[in-house]
Interface confidence: low
């Protein structure tokens, strides 16, 4: 973009420039060119010896310009077209400038002016051209700067040429206001920062509802001395709730949202959300639906799962295998885990309580991903109720729970009560008892024994009676003895492990 400070041709002769010396040299004249009246300053003192004729412009306000461009259109006659070649004739003129903070009016002093250049024509107008009214127009441009004062004058020094100055245009260059990458760059004076830095770096302003991305570079462009924008750096992005439409950020339409500053468009509100208002940054979940903290806002809202399906409890002596299937309704999530809790009830008193501490699970029961678990170390003649709860990532956001229960009665025998009946140096006589009510269910008793400290081998004796003598034992040795009832359903409860010691060879029975 060019900002014109002075345009002689456009003023149609209304600019009264100062000539020096007064009444000699340069003169304003009107001519017809291409059927149009044109004004020009002309001088043609080619035979009068040395010339020093000055034409000074009016004072020109600099505005924001730091460097100005001066475009001259002129014509020069060929010195050879004058009688005798006019020995003092020249075919060039000089261009000067002077800066000032005030208009000096008619006070003209040559010493205040600095020479810009000698202006020479590319083409001169020879006699034949002149007679055919075919003048050769030359265009020359010069640049001046940096300027620092409020205004300036230009001056043209004639040193004996035949010249007509048809156009003097002074302008400076600006990079025009521009929208790029959602950033508005202001109209900027085209100025070289230095010889080594010919580009001015300009920061852009993000358009309404646009922001510089977090951790990103703000929008920058480079304004060249020629008034052209180059090398964009950084960008602005439409802020949350807004999307890019051409060079602007528009609020997300109702039913759409955008949760962060990004290049992406607004997204449609996901399933199970309420329709959003204009400019939404998120979509609220429908009643009964939720978002886990780690769920992206683009994900459908979900709900806790229903209870697990088809829970079964299969008793196996002192063990129970629990099996279930996944909930019918997963709540729209894949992150389902199961949690098993246990309650035991004494049939005689009807009293119940938790039993997590007394039973053993085949795997930790509070974040199960599989749909089965085995519970062991169950007590005999006890009623157990197991609850299996299904949970997902949003279960923690509601107070209700989704679980199914199954009950099982443990009918295995009570552990036998064992005592040492007799002993010798090589044998131990062991007896036991169980409640009479359970004796009919016992098929045999299994006695397991081994030397204390010997974990690698053990002996097993089976008997239908309530006693056994363990022979061939080592003297003065402690044995670990356990008795277990065997029923049709499998193994009953085992007694606690007892430590019994044979007599030493020197000792006597006690």
């Amino acid at each position: 973009k060019e900002v014109v400070l002075l345009d002689f041709a456009a003023m149609k002769g209304e600019l009264g420039w100062l000539t020096h010396p007064y009444g000699k040299g340069w003169d304003l004249m009107q001519n017809i060119m291409d059927d149009m009246p044109i004004y020009m300053y002309s001088v043609c003192n080619v035979v009068s010896g040395d010339q020093d004729n000055w034409l000074r412009t009016n004072w020109v306000y600099r505005e924001e310009a730091e460097r100005i461009f001066i475009e001259l259109k002129f014509t020069v006659r060929d010195c050879n077209s004058f009688p005798g070649g006019a020995s003092s004739c020249k075919e060039t003129f000089n261009l000067y400038y002077a800066e000032s903070d005030v208009d000096y009016g008619t006070n003209f002093q040559k010493r205040q002016f600095t020479k810009i250049d000698t202006i020479a024509p590319d083409e001169i107008t020879v006699s034949s051209d002149f007679e055919a009214r075919n003048v050769k127009l030359n265009v020359e441009e010069r640049m001046v700067g940096p300027l620092t004062r409020k205004g300036f004058y230009l001056a043209f020094q004639d040193i004996g040429a035949c010249v007509a100055l048809l156009s003097v245009r002074v302008y400076y260059k600006k990079c025009p206001e521009m929208l790029q990458s959602l950033a508005r760059f202001p109209e900027t004076i085209a100025v070289a920062v230095s010889d080594t830095q010919p580009l001015a770096t300009v920061a852009g302003t993000c358009v309404d509802h646009a922001v510089v991305p977090y951790g990103g570079e703000g929008p920058l462009m480079h304004c060249t001395v020629d008034g052209e924008w180059l090398v964009p750096i950084g960008q602005c992005l439409c802020q949350e709730g807004y999307e890019k439409v051409e060079d602007a950020c528009r609020a997300c339409s109702p039913g759409f949202f955008k949760s962060e500053a990004s290049e992406s468009p607004c997204l449609e509100c996901p399933e199970h959300t309420l329709p959003s208002t204009e400019g939404a940054t998120s979509c609220q979940c429908e009643e009964g639906y939720f978002r886990a903290p780690e769920d992206p806002l683009s994900m459908s809202c979900t709900r806790p799962p229903s209870a697990p399906n088809y829970l079964t409890a299969i008793g196996m002596g002192a063990k129970v295998e629990l099996r279930w299937t996944a909930p019918k309704d997963t709540g729209g999530r894949q992150d389902i885990v199961y949690s098993v809790t246990c309650e035991q009830c004494w049939p005689e008193s009807g009293e119940c309580g938790p039993c997590e501490a007394s039973v053993r699970y085949s795997e930790p029961p509070h974040a199960l991903t599989r749909t089965s678990v085995t519970v062991s170390d169950l007590e005999p003649h006890m009623n157990y109720t197991f609850a299996v709860e299904a949970r997902n990532g949003v279960s923690g956001l509601v107070t209700s729970r989704s679980f199914r229960t199954a009950s099982v009665s443990i009918n295995q025998t009570e552990p036998p009560k064992v005592r040492l009946e007799d002993r010798s140096t090589t044998s131990l006589s062991v007896t036991w008892s169980i409640p009479v009510s359970q004796q009919s269910r016992v098929w045999k008793y299994e006695v397991t024994y081994r030397k204390k400290g010997d974990a690698n081998s053990y002996n097993v004796r089976r008997t239908e009676g309530f006693s056994v003598t363990l022979d061939d034992l080592a003297p003065d040795t402690t044995y670990l003895v356990q008795v277990q009832a065997l029923t049709q359903e499998g193994q009953g409860a085992g007694s606690k492990v007892h430590e019994f010691q044979t007599l030493s060879t020197e000792g006597s029975a006690n």
Epitope: A203, T205, C206, V211, V212, G218, Q239, E240, G241, T281
Partner: antibody, heavy 126, light 112 residues
Framework: EVQLVESGGGLVQPGGSLRLSCAAS????????MNWVRQAPGKGLEWVSY????????YYADSVKGRFTISRDNAKNSLYLQMNSLRAEDTAVYYC???????????????????WGQGTTVTVSS | QSVLTQPPSVSGAPGQRVTISCTGS?????????VHWYQQLPGTAPKLLIY???NRPSGVPDRFSGSKSGTSASLAITGLQAEDEADYYC????????????FGGGTKLTVL
Amino acid sequence: EVQLVESGGGLVQPGGSLRLSCAASGFTSSSYSMNWVRQAPGKGLEWVSYISSSSSTIYYADSVKGRFTISRDNAKNSLYLQMNSLRAEDTAVYYCARYRLPNFWSGYPNYGMDVWGQGTTVTVSS
Amino acid sequence: QSVLTQPPSVSGAPGQRVTISCTGSSSNIGAGYDVHWYQQLPGTAPKLLIYGNSNRPSGVPDRFSGSKSGTSASLAITGLQAEDEADYYCQSYDSSLSGHVVFGGGTKLTVL
């Protein structure tokens, strides 16, 4: 006309609660960050809390942290300050004031609090 | 005790020039944070007077000017008028504080 109007002040006993409101008109409040600033009788200005345009960033002065909660409803062009566990030293005129959104060109935070409400008085006394 | 220090009071005769200083530290003004100035006329809400160290919002007379240097800022009022009698507060930001916003203690300007 751009204006902010506070309401909800009054007399409350120590330990009590109050909720202040600030209604914005004449501009789109969702484009601006907002502040609460208070002024105890005969004293200077004390900044209380800040909330960004989308409520994604919230700050509190140490003196109110854990007791006061700032929030906003952009659909209603409203700003709120929930004040719990009030103390005698919370007695003041409470002003809401808007921030112009910082952006890269203006530099952060080139603009101050350019629009203020008329204030609402909170008195904490037994 | 305010993070930014202002003189409690200044005074001047009509037509005179007065300045109000605002002294901070390396974690606020000295860290490059902008300084804003507010005017609070008696019985009214504060009003933004100077923003971004030296910029005047529209409607603020050019008798008011702001500047900043190092860890300090100052507000200058030339051609003092009776209606300038008010409390003046500087405000900046402090990287060491929660929320960052800090005010000076305020300066009472009396027009003699």
